[in-house]
């Protein structure tokens, strides 16, 4: 996160860290807890690393440097990448992770509500992006979970800023015209959440951007509302019944 500040314990209890353990262990992506046994993240996090056993998912944590060999983590039972996601394109950058064992909810580890299907009418004015990613383009992973308040921008405006890309209706953009605040490398897969009527909702999944926090280059996020049918279908067919945090 560029231009952010430190988060507090329990402030973003749905935020998880997706880490890979090969010779060393490192944080690669963020993710959002959406049910006892489900994490929503970006499909591109798994490019070149599709093996379930190398991944460790840490939930209910604030500081990555607190993780030791004794820190509990979740393992992956199944990775479900959107069927239309292609490595050669930037579309449908969404994936579900089914955990091997369900997580108990606590003050520091609980799910984020999902938006309504095809939610286009809600005007979100209070949106935040969180993650342990770089604090500048040529930076490094941060120890303490960062947060930053970023306004949504219209898809029309976003398309103007990214003429060389196709901004689809299944993407949502956020950023300041002058730059300075944005997600960055290592924040991929993490949440863009917006507070509406006193409730936090998962509006976007951190996907991509041209550099980080550059002027007139907003961050681009996978629009969760556009994938509600897919999320429900995959979680229900796997569970027999949905266990998602849908909005009231």
């Amino acid at each position: 996160i560029v231009g952010g500040t430190n988060s507090s314990w329990g402030e973003w209890p749905w935020q998880v860290s997706l880490q890979v353990k090969l010779t060393a262990q490192r944080h690669l992506c963020g993710g959002s807890l959406i049910g006892h046994q489900w994490v929503l993240t970006a499909a591109h996090c798994f490019d070149g690393l599709p093996l379930q056993d190398v991944w460790r998912i840490y939930s209910g944590i604030l500081n990555l440097s607190d993780i030791t060999k004794d820190t509990p983590f979740s393992q992956i039972k199944e990775i479900i990448i959107h069927q239309n996601y292609k490595v050669s394109e930037g579309n449908h950058d969404i994936a579900l992770i089914k955990l091997q064992a369900p997580l108990n909810y606590t003050e520091f580890q609980k799910p984020i509500c999902l938006p309504s299907k095809g939610d286009t009418s809600t005007i979100y004015t209070n949106c935040w992006v969180t993650g342990w990613g770089f604090s500048k383009e040529k930076g490094e992973i941060q120890n303490i979970l960062q947060k930053v308040n970023i306004p949504l921008v219209t898809n029309e405006e976003c398309q103007k800023r990214y003429q060389d890309y196709k901004i689809t209706q299944r993407m949502v953009c956020a950023g300041y015209k002058e730059g300075g605040k944005d997600a960055c490398k290592g924040d991929s897969g993490g949440p863009l959440v917006c507070k509406h009527n006193g409730m936090w909702r998962l509006v976007g999944i951190t996907s991509w951007g041209e550099g980080c926090a550059r002027r007139e280059q907003p961050g681009v996020y996978t629009k969760v509302a556009e994938y509600m049918d897919w999320i429900l279908e995959k979680t229900q067919s796997s569970d027999g019944k949905a266990q998602m945090q849908s909005p009231a």
Epitope: S88, E89, G90, D164, Y165, K166, A183, K185, S188
Partner: antibody, heavy 125, light 108 residues
């Protein structure tokens, strides 16, 4: 199956014009940035031009700027290169290619993932 | 413009040998925008490596790419008869997009 098929090459006199076409199939053409690359006989590859998915943004190599125009018709899944004021040094095989732009570590990638078979343009009197 | 300098110009090797091809750039190139292509006579180029180190679909694992910043390398661990041809590195980090002049890998 992804296919790119160039046409329109041939022999033309210096100062003449030619229009190359590239018919695309097997992928969502309107989502892809498209490019032209050329290769003079016995030489290396030279990037010529690219066009954004919507067609609203174009960039050219200095060697062709002001003489060549890239365009596309997304309804016909076709890419074009209009070449005017042709010179002997424009003699080359012209390839069209789709530019893949995936995502890696929150940044986009960029590479020419599919190429046509090429069409030969010969500029000679 | 970003200049791409490949070395050596020609590499004469026997089947089974290891080939190491270098590509140097005149300015910093984001690895995500660095690709390698193979071209055999009379054929269109074929994508081998993208993002400096990711193998394209269908490319055998004897091909690998490494590098960062201004120095990039393509390695063919054990040359097969079909690997002979010309190899190009290319950047699309900044326009004009540029190719290296190519390295020809020939049978010794």
């Amino acid at each position: 199956e992804v296919q790119l098929l160039e046409s329109g090459g041939g022999l033309v006199q210096p100062g003449g014009s030619l229009r190359l076409s590239c018919a695309a199939s097997g992928f969502t053409f309107s989502h892809y940035l498209m490019t032209w690359v050329r290769q003079a006989p016995g030489k290396g590859l030279e990037w010529v031009s690219y066009i954004s998915p919507s067609g609203g943004h174009t960039i050219y190599a200095d060697s062709v700027k002001g003489r060549f125009t890239i365009s596309r018709d997304n309804s016909k899944n076709t890419l074009y290169l209009q070449m005017n004021s042709l010179r002997a040094e424009d003699t080359a095989v012209y390839y069209c290619a789709s530019v893949a732009r995936g995502i890696a570590a929150r940044s986009r990638t960029s590479y020419f993932n599919q190429w046509g078979q090429g069409t030969l343009v010969t500029v000679s009197s | 413009d970003i200049q791409m300098t490949q070395s050596p110009g020609t590499l004469s090797l026997s089947p089974g040998e290891r080939a190491t091809l270098s590509c140097r750039t005149s300015q910093f190139v984001n690895s995500n925008y660095l690709a390698w292509y193979q071209q055999t006579p009379g054929q269109a180029p074929r994508l081998l490596i993208y993002g400096a180190s990711s193998r394209a679909t269908g490319i055998p694992d004897r091909f690998s790419g490494t590098g960062y910043g201004t120095d990039f390398t393509l390695t063919i661990s054990r040359l097969e008869p079909e690997d002979y041809g010309t190899y190009y590195c290319q950047q699309s980090s900044r326009t004009p997009w540029t190719f290296g002049q190519g390295t020809r890998v020939e049978i010794k």
